[in-house]
Amino acid sequence: QVQLVQSGSELKKPGASVKVSCKASGYTFTQNNMDWVRQAPGQGLEWMGDINTRSGGVIYNEEFQDRLIMTVDKSTDTAYMELSSLRSEDTATYHCARRKSYGYYLDVWGEGTLVTVSS
Amino acid sequence: SYVLTQPVSVSVALGQTATITCEGEQIGSKEVHWYHQRPGQAPILVMFRDARRPSGIPERLSGSNSGNTASLTISGAEAGDEGDYYCQVWDSSSYTVFGGGTKVTVV
């Protein structure tokens, strides 16, 4: 079945970077874009960006523009999200989510990766 | 930037009907999608393009969208319907936008 499996939890110090992976299976990886959405503890969903899995084109939420890099590795059907210059407010669960090719909704979600930023 | 406003919480009696609203400027001209998130789990798409249910989502859930308000209605509420519900749209200037979420409690 369609699945998005993410890498494990991370504990990072302020100023560091984190790279989260998301391996897709059960569908043709390049048939859909991949989005990243984060959720701080007890808070709502915050969209971070969208990557085209064929062209590598990316659209970022302006809030993350300067420190977010989204990439894909088509050979392993894996998407990556790297966030740099981490601060305590970046403590959150980071989800990858498949964006339907012909619509702007997220029909399959990864289980999430908890990133804790603490000194 | 485009803003979606949801009620913080909605309470519904077992078996009764709950309606969750999502307000945004001229939201009726956009396609609205809804997600259900249970504690400790990833969100699940429960409604897309205003009123379409993904496979596996019961007919008890229905959606509508017009004017400045979109709604998700849960009929015959069950304990499993509890959790947070988020509306979402795509906007040409803000891209993907989520509402703040509504906590649904079944009593």
């Epitope: 969208d50 084109g57 090719s101 012909y102 702007y104 | -």
Partner: antibody
Framework: QSVEESGGRLVTPGTPLTLTCTVS????????MSWVRQAPGKGLEYIGY?????VTYYANWAKGRFTISKTSTTVDLKISSPTTEDTATYFC???????????????WGPGTLVTVSS | AYDMTQTPSFVEAAVGGTVTIKCQAS??????LSWYQQKPGQPPKLLIY???TLASGVSSRFKGSGSGTQFTLTISDLECADAATYYC????????????FGGGTEVVVK
């Protein structure tokens, strides 16, 4: 939402030419844009496209001969050294969905005619 | 190199009839295939995308099918207004492409 090409004219072989596609009603930071040409009485010929981030892709035959670039409201196609075989109507086309990788084009301009002749 | 071969290049059919156009990709393009209609002096018009999804405002007489390398456009209940040239286009890869479009099929309606 629309696109319109301009800059087509009669040029002599070897004279560089830049065509401009002006967009309105949408943002080039959201949509990939393509250039397609059509020689008189011939079929559609894909030239290349530019992603939301400004990365360019070209058909094999077009590499080195054409350069695609963009500003906030325009997409340019530079023909570095036109030959008579470049005589064609040049179309600018927008992807149907955001960040969609040149998948399909639902908005086309009327085209601009380039004639290369000595 | 993801090249597209379209057949036939010309087809003639009567009003009310059916026309079938085929498009073959040199490598698998999944479902990233579109069909366009072009009339003289006009830009192409998107008819079908994702191999089988009808574009907005397009008649259901147009039907797309296929995946991988083999695709078909079927036009049923032909009307005079369907007289045009039809093109397929792959939208999967632009890394190694000679032409994303097929060679075109001219449809004449009698």
């Amino acid at each position: 939402q629309s696109v319109e090409e301009s800059g087509g004219r009669l040029v002599t072989p070897g004279t560089p030419l830049t065509l401009t596609c002006t967009v309105s009603g949408f943002s080039l930071s959201s949509y990939d844009m393509s250039w397609v040409r059509q020689a008189p009485g011939k079929g559609l010929e894909y030239i290349g496209y530019i992603t939301v981030n400004g990365v360019t892709y070209y058909a094999n035959w077009a590499k080195g001969r054409f350069t695609i670039s963009k500003t906030s409201t325009t997409v340019d196609l530079k023909i570095s050294s036109p030959t008579t075989e470049d005589t064609a109507t040049y179309f600018c086309a927008r992807d149907q969905y955001i960040n969609n990788g040149g998948a399909e084009f639902n908005i086309w301009g009327p085209g601009t005619l380039v004639t290369v002749s000595s | 190199a993801y090249d597209m071969t379209q057949t036939p290049s010309f087809v003639e059919a009567a009003v009310g009839g059916t026309v079938t156009i085929k498009c073959q990709a040199s490598e698998s393009i999944s479902s990233w295939l579109s069909w366009y209609q072009q009339k003289p002096g006009q830009p192409p018009k998107l008819l079908i995308y994702q191999a089988s999804t009808l574009a907005s405002g397009v008649s259901s007489r147009f039907k797309g099918s296929g995946s991988g390398t083999q695709f078909t456009l079927t036009i049923s209940d032909l009307e005079c207004a369907d007289a045009a040239t039809y093109y397929c286009q792959q939208g999967y890869s632009y890394g190694d492409v000679d032409n994303a479009f097929g060679g075109g099929t001219e449809v004449v309606v009698k």
